[in-house]
């Protein structure tokens, strides 16, 4: 499956929206930095098969959607930007779902990618626990926004690599 160009553009648009969502000066949030342990190895195209990487992207976008769909998130960000962000994520989920089912049979997906999906879920669990611990403060959300932007950037670069391999 060739990841469509529109998916990469969608990822870039999602990044732009994330960048625009900032509400407070990031400089005041330095002491709130945290090691979320982004599971980079899960997205390493050299070690893992394409279907696994795509499956991990899918889980990451799904978890991002879940994270930004909460009531606490709605209170933290601009509603218009948030709605546009949901649309981009939803479109990417559709693209990736089509891609994963084309790559391997639906039955195999769950078994084959269990470890990578679990790693992504644990990563988002750490993010959620961090936000809870910080009582969903504006700085905690800024740190999370920066983290999600970094993980999106990483996956965008890998997607370019996957397309080149085809």
């Amino acid at each position: 499956c060739d990841l469509p160009q529109t998916h990469s553009l969608g990822n870039r648009r999602a990044l732009i929206l994330l960048a625009q969502m900032g509400r407070i000066s990031h400089f005041s949030c330095l002491k709130d930095r945290y090691d979320f342990g982004f599971p980079q190895e899960v997205f390493d195209g050299n070690q893992f098969q394409k279907a696994q990487a795509i499956s991990a992207f899918h889980e990451m976008i799904q978890q991002t959607f879940n994270l930004f769909s909460t009531k606490d998130s709605s209170a933290a960000w601009d509603e218009t930007l948030l709605d546009k962000f949901y649309i981009e994520l939803f479109q990417q989920l559709n693209d990736l779902e089509a891609c994963v089912t084309q790559e391997v049979g639906v039955e195999e997906i769950a078994l084959m990618n269990e470890d990578s999906i679990l790693a992504v879920r644990k990563y988002f669990q750490r993010i959620t626990l961090y936000l809870m611990g910080k009582k969903y403060s504006p700085c905690a959300w800024e740190v999370v926004r920066a983290e999600i932007m970094r993980s999106f950037s990483f996956s965008t670069n890998l997607q370019k690599g996957l397309r080149r391999k085809d």
Partner: antibody, heavy 121, light 107 residues
């Protein structure tokens, strides 16, 4: 390969203006902040200020607030440090360095080669 | 501003020696402490970040420890290329501040 390339050495007279540059390459310029550090001859490192090139938000050390201006042009991946009226005490080596912002990653992991500014009448 | 105080300001040591440099912050900075090495005419080089994480490409003889206000940089076995000036720097809050530096000289 990540690189920060600074503009060349400058010799100026007191009262003159100056703008030095720091061009980033090999990474996403807007994903990192750019900090500026001064080192006067034979002295230690002094942190001057920082800019987030994604939105040009800046922060200065109180010692340098109002003395210098930090700016960036993300379209050409370049940060700037400028003076409107130089003094002899501005004579120093100026370094730029990148910072990962709010991400959990090494601080100031890449530095420019430095720009020597000499102010003398 | 957070003040960073390094000690000693200079030291003389021989190749193979174990060298320890300390850095004290005027208030708690958690683990947001970096160590840099600078040689004459060169830009500083990051050695240790977040108090104890070794920067990629830096020899394992360099190590960092500490949290809160007291931090240490240790060179387990000094090599000829290690003679330089070392700076600590806090990145807990702006403005970032550096220690005054520790010059490591040949005995």
């Amino acid at each position: 390969e990540v690189q920060l390339v600074q503009s060349g050495a400058e010799v100026k007279k007191p009262g003159e203006s100056l703008k030095i540059s720091c061009k980033g390459s090999g990474y996403s310029f807007t994903s990192y902040w750019i900090g500026w550090v001064r080192q006067m001859p034979g002295k230690g490192l002094e942190w001057m200020g920082i800019i987030d090139p994604s939105d040009s938000d800046t922060a200065y050390s109180p010692s340098f607030q109002g003395q210098v201006t930090i700016s960036a042009d993300k379209s050409i991946s370049t940060a700037y440090l400028q003076w409107s009226s130089l003094k002899a005490s501005d004579t120093a080596m100026y370094y730029c360095a990148r910072h990962p912002g709010l991400n959990w990653a090494p601080d100031f992991d890449y530095w420019g080669q430095g720009t020597l500014v000499t102010v003398s009448s | 501003d957070i003040q960073m105080t390094q000690s000693p300001s200079s030291l003389s040591a021989s190749v193979g020696d174990r060298v320890t440099i300390t850095c004290r912050a005027s208030q708690s900075i958690s683990k947001f402490l970096n160590w840099y090495q600078q040689k004459p005419g060169k830009a500083p080089k990051l050695l240790i970040y977040f108090a104890s994480s070794l920067q990629s490409g830096v020899p394992s003889r360099f190590s960092g420890s500490g949290s809160g206000t007291d931090f240490t940089l240790t060179i387990s076995s000094l090599q000829p290329e290690d003679f330089a000036t070392y700076y600590c720097q806090q990145s807990n809050t702006l403005p970032f501040t550096f220690g005054q530096g520790t010059k490591v000289e040949i005995k």
